[in-house]
Interface confidence: medium
C-alpha cells in the first residue's frame, strides 16, 4: 500500500456532476465529413448530367429560354464552391495547426501507439488508451480541470485488468468517480452508476474516489492526491 | 438569340464542369495525402499545444505492453528467478530491461516494487554487463561497486538498485526498442 500521507485541505470542494467533459476533436471526423461531401457532390453531378442529357433535345427543338441551363450552371456553381471550400479547408487547416504547434512553448514529440502516433511522448500507451501519469498532487476538482485542459478526462477504470495494471504503475491516484453525498450513489464522469466496491464509503465526508494499490477507496475531495488522465484511442 | 444564350450557358456549364472535375481530383489527392498523414500523425493530441513527431518509426506495442518514449515495456506481476525472467523476455522477442538512464521509467517512479533487470556480472570482462554486452555506466548506480558479483540486480523505478541471489524470485521488466 502506498503509505504516503494524504494531505487534507480545509477547503473541501465538492465535485460538480454537471461539468461536461470535453471530447477531443480529431482530424478524422473532418476528413470523414469531407468524404461525405464528395459523395454527395458526385451524386448531384450525376443527377445534373442526367437532367442535362434527358432534357437536351426537348429544349432545342422548341427553342425555349434556357432555364435548365441556368439551373445546371447554378448547381455546378454550388458544387464548385463546396469543392473549393473543401480544398481550402484541407490545405489551410493542417498548416494553421502546424503553425499553432510551432508557436507552442511545449515541444512534445508524439509517440505512435497501436494505430500509430496517438500519444505524446510523456504519456504512456496501454491497451488502446493514453495515460498521463501525473506527479503533482491536486484536489479532485483541480485534477478534473487539469485533465480537461489536456483534452482528456480524469482517470477512469473500465475493468479489473486495467486496475491491476495501473496499480503496478502508480500506487495511488484520483479516479473519475464521485458522489454528491453519502446518501447518493457513486457515479462515473458520464453519470453512470459505478457498481464496484469503494472502501470507506460509510464516511460521509469522503465523496471522491481514489485508486490505491488494487483497491478503490473513498477520500475527501479537497485532499491533495496525485492525479492521472486518460484518453481512449 | 435563344440559341446563342443556350450555347453560352452550355459553355459556362461546361467550364464549371471541368473546374468541378479538376477540384474533385485535387480534393481526392489531398484526401489521400491526409489519410497517409493520419497514419503518421495522431488523431488525438492530449494537450492544446503539442508538436507532432512526423517521421518517427516508433509504432505499436503488443497487447498488455506499455508504450513510453518509443519503447515497449512488459511489467510483470508474477515473480520469477532472474534466468526465468530472461527467458520469458526472450520468448517475447525482447530482453530484460536495459536502462539508458535512471529516469527511463519515469512513469513508474512511485512504484515500490523491485524488478529484475538485464544486468549481470561477467567474470570474463570483470565488469557488470547488460544483456547486449555493453558495460554498466558508473553513473547509473553509484552503489554498484558494492554489489556482490555472484548476484543479479533488481531495480526500483525510483532509481534504486540492489543485488540479490539470482535464484530469488522477483517481478521483472522486459523491454523492446521500437527505433
Amino acid at each position: 500500500m502506498d503509505n504516503q500521507g494524504v494531505i487534507y485541505s480545509d477547503l473541501n470542494l465538492p465535485p460538480n456532476p454537471k461539468r461536461q467533459q470535453r471530447k477531443p476533436k480529431g482530424n478524422k471526423n473532418s476528413i470523414l465529413a469531407t468524404e461525405q461531401e464528395i459523395t454527395y457532390a458526385e451524386l448531384n453531378l450525376q443527377k445534373a448530367s442526367q437532367d442535362f442529357q434527358g432534357n437536351d433535345k426537348t429544349y432545342h427543338c422548341k427553342d425555349l429560354p434556357s432555364a435548365p441551363e441556368k439551373l445546371i450552371v447554378g448547381i455546378l456553381g454550388i458544387i464548385c464552391l463546396i469543392l473549393m471550400a473543401s480544398v481550402v479547408t484541407i490545405v489551410v487547416i493542417p498548416s494553421t495547426l502546424i503553425q499553432r504547434h510551432n508557436n507552442s512553448s511545449l515541444n512534445t514529440r508524439t509517440q505512435k501507439a497501436r494505430h500509430c502516433g496517438h500519444c505524446p511522448e510523456e504519456w504512456i500507451t496501454y491497451s488502446n488508451s493514453c495515460y498521463y501519469i501525473g506527479k503533482e498532487r491536486r484536489t479532485w476538482e483541480e485534477s478534473l480541470l487539469a485533465c480537461t485542459s489536456k483534452n482528456s478526462s480524469l482517470l477512469s477504470i473500465d475493468n479489473e485488468e486495467e486496475m491491476k495494471f495501473l496499480s503496478i504503475i502508480s500506487p495511488s491516484s484520483w479516479i473519475g468517480v464521485f458522489r454528491n453525498s453519502s446518501h447518493h450513489p457513486w457515479v462515473t464522469m458520464n453519470g453512470l452508476a459505478f457498481k464496484h466496491e469503494i472502501k470507506d464509503s460509510d464516511n460521509a465526508e469522503l465523496n471522491c474516489a481514489v485508486l490505491q494499490v488494487n483497491r478503490l477507496k473513498s477520500a475527501q475531495c479537497g485532499s491533495s492526491i496525485i492525479y492521472h488522465c486518460k484518453h481512449k484511442l | 438569340m435563344a440559341v446563342f444564350k443556350t450555347t453560352l450557358w452550355r459553355l459556362i456549364s461546361g467550364t464549371l464542369g471541368i473546374i468541378c472535375l479538376s477540384l474533385m481530383s485535387t480534393l481526392g489527392i489531398l484526401l489521400k495525402n491526409s489519410f497517409t498523414k493520419l497514419s503518421i500523425e495522431p488523431a488525438f493530441t492530449p494537450g492544446p499545444n503539442i508538436e507532432l513527431q512526423k517521421d518517427s518509426d516508433c509504432c505499436s506495442c503488443q497487447e498488455k505492453w506499455v508504450g513510453y518514449r518509443c519503447n515497449c515495456y512488459f511489467i510483470s506481476s508474477e515473480q520469477k528467478t532472474w534466468n526465468e525472467s530472461r527467458h520469458l523476455c526472450a520468448s517475447q522477442k525482447s530482453s530484460l530491461l536495459q536502462l539508458q538512464n535512471t529516469d527511463e521509467l519515469d512513469f513508474m517512479s512511485s512504484s515500490q516494487q523491485f524488478y529484475w533487470i538485464g544486468l549481470s556480472y561477467s567474470e570474463e570482462h570483470t565488469a557488470w554487463l547488460w544483456e547486449n554486452g555493453s558495460a554498466l555506466s558508473q553513473y547509473l548506480f553509484p552503489s554498484f561497486e558494492t554489489f556482490n558479483t555472484k548476484n543479479c540486480i533488481a531495480y526500483n523505478p525510483n532509481g534504486n538498485a540492489l543485488d540479490e541471489s539470482c535464484e530469488d524470485k522477483n517481478r521483472y521488466i522486459c523491454k523492446q526498442q521500437l527505433i
Epitope: M1, K164, S167, V213 | S77
Partner: antibody, heavy 118, light 107 residues
Framework: EVQLVESGGGLVKPGGSLRLSCAAS????????MNWVRQAPGKGLEWVSA????????YYADSVKGRFTISRDNAKNSLYLQMNSLRAEDTAVYYC???????????WGQGILVTVSS | AIQLTQSPSSLSASVGDRVTITCRAS??????LAWYQQKPGKAPKLLIY???SLKSGVPSRFSGSGSGTDFTLTISSLQPEDFATYYC?????????FGQGTRLEIK
Amino acid sequence: EVQLVESGGGLVKPGGSLRLSCAASGFTFSSHSMNWVRQAPGKGLEWVSAISSSSSYIYYADSVKGRFTISRDNAKNSLYLQMNSLRAEDTAVYYCAREEWGLPFDYWGQGILVTVSS
Amino acid sequence: AIQLTQSPSSLSASVGDRVTITCRASQGIPSALAWYQQKPGKAPKLLIYDASSLKSGVPSRFSGSGSGTDFTLTISSLQPEDFATYYCQQFNSYPLTFGQGTRLEIK
C-alpha cells in the same frame, strides 16, 4: 446472492485427467478475476491458478504448471480447470474463488473432492 | 515465491480471551495481506483485507494490523463461534501464497 458451485470431481488414476467446472451466479461474472484454490486432506490452503476477467492474464502455481489449464466462458458464467497428468499429491478439495477487483477472495464455492489413486 | 510463516501453529484459549496470531512474509508486501477463517468441512471466509480493513459483515472484534513483512490478526474477545483455523494470504504478487494456518482451539 453470489453463488459458486463446483462440479466434475471424483476418483481418477495417476496420469489421468479430470475437468472441474465452477458455475457462477448472482454477480457480473465477466467483471471478476477467478481463482482455483485447493486443500489436501488435513492440510492448509494452496493457491492453484488465476484467470483475469477477460482471460488476458493467467497464472499457475509451480506445482501444477504445464499440467493444469484454467479457462473461462463469460457467456456461460463458468470457470474451468482442466487437470492432466494427475498425481497422488493432487488429491484435495478444490475450491473456486472470486476476486472483487483486486481484493482477495471474497466468495468461495463449497469445494469439490478430487482423489488421485490407483 | 513469497513465503508466509504463521505463528503459533495452534493455540488454546477461552471464551472472552484476547488472541493474537502473527504472519511474517519472506519479503515486503506493503499491505497486500488478507486473513481468512475456516471451519471444518467448510470453505474459507474472508475476514480482513489490505492488512487492516474489515470485510463488511465481519464482527468488529476482529482486527488486523501491520505492513511490510510483519502482520497480526487480533480477536479482542473470543466467542464460541471463533474457534476455527485462521490463514493469512498475500496478494501482492503471483504466485499467491497462504500461511500454513493457525488452529485456534477451546482451552
